[in-house]
C-alpha cells in the first residue's frame, strides 16, 4: 500500500491581476477515504478557499471532476485575481471522521504572488560620437516588473559583456520595480555595423527574455585618412590630382581644394563608396592648369568630417615632364 503524498509542484506561482490562477495538487493514493480541501495560510486563522462538499466559492473551479471515484487531481482555478489573493495555498487531505472529518495530511503549499512583466528594455547611447579605442557608455532601462528578481545581460555582436553596473529600485518592498544598467563599451574601428543588446530575463517571461538594442553607428566616429596623388599622365596643359578620403563614418563630409592657398570652387568629379564594414570612401579629382613658366604649384585637399576640425593633405605639383618625383606633406 502506497503512503499518501500530497503533491503541490509549484513552490511559487506568479499571477497577473484580472487573470485566472491554477493551483495544482495531486495525491498518490485515494486512501484513507476522505475529502481534499484548499486553504490559504496555516493555523486556526487559515481561510477556506474550496470545499467540494459545502460552501459557495464562485471564483473557484476544479480542474478535474472531483465526484469521480478514482480522481487523484484536486487542482483548482481561481478567476479574476486581485492583490487580495496573494498568499500561500495548501491542499489538505482529510480522513472521514465523526463528528467531523480529521485533517490527515497537507501539501507543502504554493505561494501565489502578483507578477508583472518588465517593459521592453530601452537602450540609450552616448549623446556625442566618439572615435575608436575610446570607451562609451550605454544605459538600459526596464520598468514595472514584479517580483524584484531579474537578470540583465549585455552583448556586443552576440558576445557577452562584463563591464557593466546594474541597479534595481526600490530596494524595499514594492508593487513594481525598475532596473537600470550602464555598460562600458570600447569602440573598435569596425563597429559601424555593430550592435549592443540589453537582455532582460524575468520569471513572468517564461524563459523568453526581452531585448533592447542600440546601433554603435550612432555612437562612433571613424575619422578619415587622406591621400593626395598626382596622375602620371597629363592632358595638354592639365594635370589630374586625386584626393582619396578613406574609411570614415558618418557620411557627413566637406571637401575643398586650394591652389597655392587659394580656395578653388571647381572639382572635376567625385565618387562615394561604402566599405563592407560600413565606413565610406570619398574620391575627388581636381584638374590643374599648368604652364612651363609656373615653377611651383601646391595643391591642398582639406576635409571637414562630421563637424570636427579640418584635416588637410598637400601636394607639390611636379610640372617638369621628365621629373617623376612627387613630394607631399600633411598639415592638421
Amino acid at each position: 500500500e502506497e503512503e499518501l503524498q500530497m503533491i503541490q509542484p509549484e513552490k511559487l506561482l506568479l499571477v497577473t491581476v484580472g487573470k485566472t490562477a491554477t493551483l495544482h495538487c495531486t495525491v498518490t493514493s485515494l486512501l484513507p477515504v476522505g475529502p481534499v480541501l484548499w486553504f490559504r495560510g496555516v493555523g486556526p486563522g487559515r481561510e477556506l478557499i474550496y470545499n467540494q462538499k459545502e460552501g459557495h466559492f464562485p471564483r473557484v473551479t476544479t480542474v478535474s471532476d472531483l465526484t469521480k471515484r478514482n480522481n487523484m487531481d484536486f487542482s483548482i482555478r481561481i478567476s479574476s485575481i486581485t492583490p487580495a489573493d496573494v498568499g500561500t495555498y495548501y491542499c489538505v487531505k482529510f480522513r472521514k471522521g465523526s463528528p467531523e472529518n480529521v485533517e490527515f495530511k497537507s501539501g507543502p503549499g504554493t505561494e501565489m504572488a502578483l507578477g508583472a512583466k518588465p517593459s521592453a528594455p530601452v537602450v540609450l547611447g552616448p549623446a556625442a560620437r566618439t572615435t575608436p579605442e575610446h570607451t562609451v557608455s550605454f544605459t538600459c532601462e526596464s520598468h514595472g516588473f514584479s517580483p524584484r528578481d531579474i537578470t540583465l545581460k549585455w552583448f556586443k555582436n552576440g558576445n557577452e559583456l562584463s563591464d557593466f553596473q546594474t541597479n534595481v529600485d526600490p530596494t524595499g518592498q514594492s508593487v513594481a520595480y525598475s532596473i537600470r544598467s550602464t555598460a562600458r563599451v570600447v569602440l573598435d574601428p569596425w563597429d559601424v555595423r555593430s550592435q549592443v543588446i540589453c537582455e532582460v530575463a524575468h520569471v513572468t517571461l517564461q524563459g523568453d527574455p526581452l531585448r533592447g538594442t542600440a546601433n554603435l553607428s550612432e555612437a562612433i566616429r571613424v575619422p578619415p585618412t587622406l591621400e593626395v596623388t598626382q596622375q602620371p599622365m597629363r592632358v595638354g596643359n592639365q594635370v589630374n590630382v586625386t584626393c582619396q578620403v578613406r574609411k570614415f563614418y558618418p557620411q557627413s563630409l566637406q571637401l575643398t581644394w586650394s591652389e597655392n592657398g587659394n580656395v578653388c570652387q571647381r572639382e572635376t568629379a567625385s565618387t562615394l563608396t561604402e566599405n563592407k564594414d560600413g565606413t565610406y570612401n570619398w574620391t575627388s579629382w581636381f584638374l590643374v592648369n599648368i604652364s612651363d613658366q609656373r615653377d611651383d604649384v601646391v595643391l591642398t585637399c582639406q576635409v571637414k568630417h562630421d563637424g570636427q576640425l579640418a584635416v588637410s593633405k598637400r601636394l607639390a605639383l611636379e610640372v617638369t615632364v621628365h621629373q617623376k618625383d612627387q613630394s607631399s606633406d600633411a598639415t592638421p
Partner: antibody, heavy 120, light 107 residues
Framework: QVQLVQSGAEVKKPGASVKVSCKAS????????ISWVRQAPGQGLEWMGW????????NYAQKLQGRVTMTTDTSTSTAYMELRSLRSDDTAVYYC?????????????WGRGTLVTVSS | DIQMTQSPSSVSASVGDRVTITCRAS??????LAWYQQKPGKAPKLLIY???NLQSGVPSRFSGSGSGTDFTLTISSLQPEDFATYYC?????????FGGGTKVEIK
Amino acid sequence: QVQLVQSGAEVKKPGASVKVSCKASGYTFHGYGISWVRQAPGQGLEWMGWISAYSGETNYAQKLQGRVTMTTDTSTSTAYMELRSLRSDDTAVYYCAREAGSSWYDFDLWGRGTLVTVSS
Amino acid sequence: DIQMTQSPSSVSASVGDRVTITCRASQGISSWLAWYQQKPGKAPKLLIYAASNLQSGVPSRFSGSGSGTDFTLTISSLQPEDFATYYCQQGASFPITFGGGTKVEIK
C-alpha cells in the same frame, strides 16, 4: 478478490445480544469506513451506523444509540456490530457495507447479509 | 434528519421500456445521492454515485441526474435482469437515509 464476508445467521431471544462480524479482503481495510445497514422482512433499508476502520470513530443512528456498538480489528481486517437488548422488531438481515465516497457517503461493496431472528 | 421520498413505490413495465424513478430530499444535498438495485435475497448493488456517476461495471442504460433536492434514475431500455427494487440514498450527512424503494415489476 475484493469482498466482505459476514458471519452466519443467528437466532436470539428478546433481551439478548448479537455480534455480527464482517471480514474484509482484497483491499486496504483501514483506508475505508464501514457502515451497517439492516433490512426487516419485506421492508426497506435502514442505516444503523458507521465506523472508521482507520481510527475507530463511530456515528450511530439515534434510534439505536446506547444499544449498538461498532468496532474493528485492523489486524484481522474485521468489523463487528453488536446489538444489545434485542427486541422482536430487530429481526432483520444485517449488512456490512464499505463506504467509498470521498466528500460524501455511499456503499460500493456489500456483504451478503446476516439474518438475525429475535424470537421467544 | 434528511427524509428521502421515492416515487413511484412500484412501476409495471415491459422489456425495452424507458423507466424513470424520482427521489426527493427534504433539504438540499448537492449531488450527494446514490442509487442501488436490490434483488430478492441479495445485497444491494451500487449503480450510481454522486447523482450522475455510473459505478464501474454497471451497464450504460442506467443514468442518474439532478442536484439539490430532486433526483432521477433512468433505465433507458429495460432488460429482463433489471426487474428489482431500487433505492436512493443521501450521503451528504449523518444520519445516512434511504428512500422507501421503488419496485420495478413485469407488466
